[in-house]
């Protein structure tokens, strides 16, 4: 019992403070209407006014609306926090051509390097693909844009890189009605960059689904667009994304234009038999019985096996603190919590390896 530990109930009789068991210290009690900016505020400046959901407290102490990433060419990079706006960026496969505060006003699709060129720098959310001429060492398969989606490994071309600039959009001059033909041969496989749909007076929709620029004869700038629920694989083929429709699976990452959907076992289950981008067989997460102990192994990949505990040991299947509460820093998805009375398991990440501590408790290997 530490000598410097304050008197729990009253924090030495100071009504403006309270004792937080989780951090074992006295914390400043924020006045009514103000909320702590941290778990255990120490002074009045650690308290702030609470804004409405989707608002943040700006530098001038004003509640300001967080930007929204609801446009379909945007994804959330950082969430709306009490003191900072949500930050949006262009979704995978696109880059920002016109930036905006905490967001992007206009996203364009990454260019595909034309024939005779290879990718020097792949496109990011901020920058378009940078192409450079293929060096003599590049395989002949790179003679056409279809076969030259990625640079050949091992080749380091010396030529000066050529950034591919975004297509000049004509969409802003289009009438509100009619998209497909007025956008003169709107490419049936994504071209680089549709203009922002809002500029043609329509509600925002996925740029990949709205009229786009022409795909000129002989151009290498038209990215092949697969059907919904298909993705462009490394060989340039449209391949069906895996389905997570089985009851014991949940979607881990969505089906994107260039990557499959990935599935994982739902909370409370673990993968017994893995499969590409999914799990072929999920099993309920093992419960420690009184006379069994889980044998350490890679739980995410293999069937769980049980063996008798060493003589004289009693496995403890309740790794929670004595008061039955989880430590404040730990959430149920980060630690294995077993209710020893009800013998129920709480969710843990199905991909996390599980090991055993010296006491026989299952612990999460943070990797």
């Amino acid at each position: 019992f530490p000598q410097d530990r304050p008197f729990e109930d009253t924090c030495h009789g100071n009504p403006s403070h309270y004792y937080d068991k989780a951090v074992r210290r006295c914390c400043y009690r924020c006045p009514m209407g103000l909320f702590p900016t941290q778990q255990c505020p120490q002074r009045p400046t650690d308290c702030r006014k609470q804004c409405e959901p989707d608002y943040y407290l700006d530098e001038a102490d004003r509640c300001t609306a967080c930007v929204t990433c609801s446009r379909d060419d945007l994804v959330e990079k950082t969430p709306c926090a009490w003191n900072s706006s949500r930050v949006c960026e262009c979704r995978p496969g696109m880059f920002c051509s016109t930036s905006a505060v905490n967001s992007c006003a206009r996203c364009f699709f990454h260019s595909v390097c034309p024939a005779g060129m290879i990718v020097k720098f792949p496109g990011t959310a901020q920058k378009n693909t940078v192409c450079e001429p293929a060096s003599p060492g590049v395989s002949p398969a790179c003679a056409s844009p279809e076969n030259c989606k990625e640079p050949s490994s091992g080749t380091i071309p010396q030529a000066k890189p050529t950034p591919v600039s975004p297509a000049t959009s004509s969409a802003s001059t289009m009438p509100v009605r009619g998209g497909t033909r007025l956008a003169q041969e709107a490419a049936s496989k994504l071209t680089r960059a549709p203009d922002s749909p809002s500029s043609v007076g329509r509600p925002s929709s996925d740029p990949g689904l709205s009229p786009t620029q022409p795909c000129p004869e002989g151009s290498g700038d038209c990215r092949k667009q697969c059907e919904p629920d298909y993705y462009l694989d490394e060989a340039g083929r449209c391949t069906a994304c895996v389905s997570c429709s089985r009851d014991d699976l949940v979607e881990k990452t969505p089906c994107a234009w260039n990557s499959s959907r990935t599935c994982e076992c739902r909370p409370g289950m673990i993968c017994a038999t893995s499969a590409t981008n999914s799990c072929a067989r999920c099993v309920p997460y093992p419960i420690c019985a009184a006379e069994t102990v889980t044998k350490p192994q890679d739980m995410a990949e293999k069937d769980t096996t049980f063996e008798a505990p060493p003589l004289g040991t009693q496995p403890d299947c309740n790794p929670t603190p004595e008061n039955g509460e989880a430590p404040a820093s730990t959430s149920p998805t980060q630690s294995l919590l077993v209710d020893s009375q009800a013998s129920k398991t709480l969710p843990i990440p199905t991909s996390a390896p599980v090991a055993l501590s010296s006491t026989g408790k299952p612990v999460l290997d943070a990797g």
Epitope: A187, S188, K189, S205, L209, E217, E227, P228, C238
Partner: antibody, heavy 119, light 111 residues
């Protein structure tokens, strides 16, 4: 001007094969999916599949898979649909249609090719 | 596969009157904030002609009297004031899942 011109009508015996062509002009043939659609006499429309001429990638309707082969010749900007093991229910008009970008609609269609399967 | 149920099978409307055709999908056609529902018009001896894409966007060159609405699983095509040249078969199509499928068609005729 975008145009899709299909080959002429065919009369075939059951068990044989037919190959319908669709010549494209007025656009970058390699960069658009070419779809094929069946319409039996007095009936509705049935999607057969599609091909991306740029690399020969295909999607098929499972109902036709195994009997239908979609190919494309970039040099002549021509797409082909070959249907094998013909039976009487294959009698229909077959359309080729270009799929536009993004919204997956078919904006330009060929005039159609009537294939009659009769013994 | 996604089944599209189109109704009615046929529709007799007076010239100048409104005609509405419905199309119900067996599952949602939503995709990145839009619905992958298309509408085509087909006249005898001709290939289908694209009218509406993404459920409600009117293709260029298509008269203003045609409009599309709906989301999720329920969609409709409306001809606000029927003209003689609108006499045709109308088909809905979904592109949400492979294989793409069509509705059975609705025949629009003059009453």
């Amino acid at each position: 001007e975008v145009q899709l011109v299909q080959s002429g009508a065919e009369v075939k015996k059951p068990g044989s094969s037919v190959k319908v062509s669709c010549k494209a002009s007025g656009y970058a043939f390699s960069s658009y999916w070419m779809n094929w659609v069946k319409q039996a006499p007095g009936q509705g429309l049935e999607w057969i599949g599609q091909i991306y001429p740029g690399d020969g990638d295909t999607n098929y309707n499972g109902k036709f898979k195994g009997r239908v082969t979609l190919t494309a010749d970039k040099s002549s900007s021509t797409a082909y649909m070959e249907l094998s093991s013909l039976r009487s229910e294959d009698t229909a008009v077959y359309f080729c249609a270009r799929r536009i970008n993004g919204n997956f609609a078919m904006d330009y269609w060929g005039q159609g090719t009537l294939v009659t399967v009769s013994s | 596969e996604i089944v599209l149920t189109q109704s009615p099978d046929s529709l007799a409307v007076s010239l100048g009157e409104r005609a509405t055709i419905n199309c119900r999908a067996s599952e949602s056609l939503e995709y990145y904030g839009t619905s992958l529902m298309l509408w085509y018009q087909q006249k005898p001896g001709q290939p289908p002609k694209l009218l509406i894409y993404s459920a409600s966007n009117v293709e260029s060159g298509v008269p203003d009297r045609f409009s599309g609405s709906g989301s999720g699983t329920d969609f409709s095509l409306t001809i606000s004031s029927l003209e003689p040249e609108d006499i045709a078969m109308y088909f809905c199509q979904q592109r949400r899942k492979v294989p793409s499928t069509f509705g059975g068609g609705t025949k629009v005729e003059i009453k």
